[in-house]
């Protein structure tokens, strides 16, 4: 009785169960009555990452420097190359096919999380008591100056974009 289903790491062909090829190898011949499945290793710059019956290996991803990409992890016969972005850039998608410059946080916003090769800058509004007067991809919100610790008084209130202005205490009582 020919099988209708096969074990794990097997596939059904011509009414018989044949072994799949292991990761890093491609199928060159299905099994027969007289031979096992025949597999061959993937070539240089190729990979297959699963048990498979593929007749061609996949090409490793190319990290194109013209798109701001560089190799983060070199591919093997069983894994694809992982690309990341050059300094100052981050991936536009999870598959990292191209890069864009990190965004800067505008005045009134500070950096909550500095960008990486795969994620953009995360900005946050400066809360009361903090300010940012620059457009930056690195600067966090800074606290307003404490006039009291300098024996000074606030002459001009701070905002989310400006520091307080301190001045001498009024001597007249």
């Amino acid at each position: 009785e020919p099988p209708t289903a096969c074990r794990e790491k097997q596939y059904l062909i011509n009414s018989q169960c044949c072994s799949l090829c292991q990761p890093g190898q491609k199928l060159v011949s299905d099994c027969t009555e007289f031979t096992e499945t025949e597999c061959l290793p993937c070539g240089e710059s190729e990979f297959l990452d699963t048990w498979n019956r593929e007749t061609r290996c996949h090409q490793h991803k190319y990290c194109d420097p013209n798109l701001g990409l560089r190799v983060q992890q070199k591919g093997t016969s069983e894994t694809d190359t992982i690309c990341t972005c050059e300094e100052g850039l981050h991936c536009t998608s999870e598959s990292c096919e191209s890069c864009v410059p990190h965004r800067s946080c505008l005045p009134g916003f500070g950096v909550k999380q500095i960008a990486t090769g795969v994620s953009d800058t995360i900005c946050e509004p400066c809360p009361v008591g903090f300010f940012s007067n620059v457009s930056s991809a690195f600067e966090k919100c800074r606290p307003w100056t404490s006039c009291e610790t300098k024996d000074l008084v606030v002459q001009q209130a701070g905002t989310n974009k400006t520091d307080v202005v301190c001045g001498p205490q009024d001597r007249q009582r």
Epitope: S19, V28, C31, F34, E38, L40, T55, R56
Partner: antibody, heavy 114, light 112 residues
Framework: QVQLKESGPGLVAPSQSLSITCTVS????????VHWVRQPPGKGLEWLGV???????NYNSALMSRLSISKDNSKSQVFLKMNSLQKDDTAIYYC????????WGAGTTVTVSS | DVVMTQTPLSLPVSLGDQASISCRSS???????????LQWYLQKPGQSPGLLIY???NRFSGVPDRFSGSGSGTDFTLKISRVEAEDLGVYFC?????????FGGGTKLEIK
């Protein structure tokens, strides 16, 4: 039904190269591999190599430097080429289809002699 | 490479006798799938080899039931229960579990 027919030069001078053609019928080269085996006079069988359906090849490591196997799917022909022949390459050369080990060609006799 | 060792080299028999040929491999012929790819061929004088047995014990179609194969791992046997004149020739074992495929040196079955 499956048939294979080998054809070769018969006589080859030492240090010269050998070219043999295997013409197949009853099965398709784009979907099946073809193996080459040889048998020196009065001796055992030796597997030489295979060309798979997609054109990939495996060779006997002892002969790899002198051997190449190619094919022409459109003509249903497989070619064996061997360089730098010596007397001990004198043999009957057989081709057989992968998965058709019940069917061997009649073989072609190759004699290496000056 | 897997070395296939056949014994005896020559086997003189009388017609009607039982004949037994041994084939040993230098490493196990059991594939990770559990299958064992060991074949037996008969080459009659002036002819190409003909398949008798595949996967250790499966008789190829049209092969008489007086031929039987057995064994496992590295040790295999071909038995002919009652030798007939048409059985004379050279018997080869062959393994196709591991590339390169390899053959035994042959056993010549001849009349005493």
């Amino acid at each position: 039904q499956v048939q294979l027919k080998e054809s070769g030069p018969g006589l080859v001078a030492p240090s010269q190269s050998l070219s043999i053609t295997c013409t197949v019928s009853g099965f398709s080269l784009p979907t099946s591999g073809v193996h080459w085996v040889r048998q020196p006079p009065g001796k055992g069988l030796e597997w030489l190599g295979v060309i798979w359906a997609g054109g990939d090849t495996n060779y006997n490591s002892a002969l790899m430097s002198r051997l190449s196997i190619s094919k022409d799917n459109s003509k249903s022909q497989v070619f064996l080429k061997m360089n730098s022949l010596q007397k001990d390459d004198t043999a009957i050369y057989y081709c057989l289809g992968h998965g058709h080990f019940d069917v061997w060609g009649a073989g072609t006799t190759v004699t290496v002699s000056s | 490479d897997v070395v296939m060792t056949q014994t005896p080299l020559s086997l003189p028999v009388s017609l009607g006798d039982q004949a037994s040929i041994s084939c040993r491999s230098s490493q196990s012929l059991v594939h990770s799938s559990g299958n064992t790819y060991l074949q037996w061929y008969l080459q009659k004088p002036g002819q190409s080899p003909g398949l008798l047995i595949y996967k250790v014990s499966n008789r190829f179609s049209g092969v008489p039931d007086r031929f039987s194969g057995s064994g496992s791992g590295t040790d295999f046997t071909l038995k002919i229960s009652r030798v007939e004149a048409e059985d004379l020739g050279v018997y080869f074992c062959s393994q196709t579990t591991h590339v390169p495929w390899t053959f035994g040196g042959g056993t010549k079955l001849e009349i005493k």
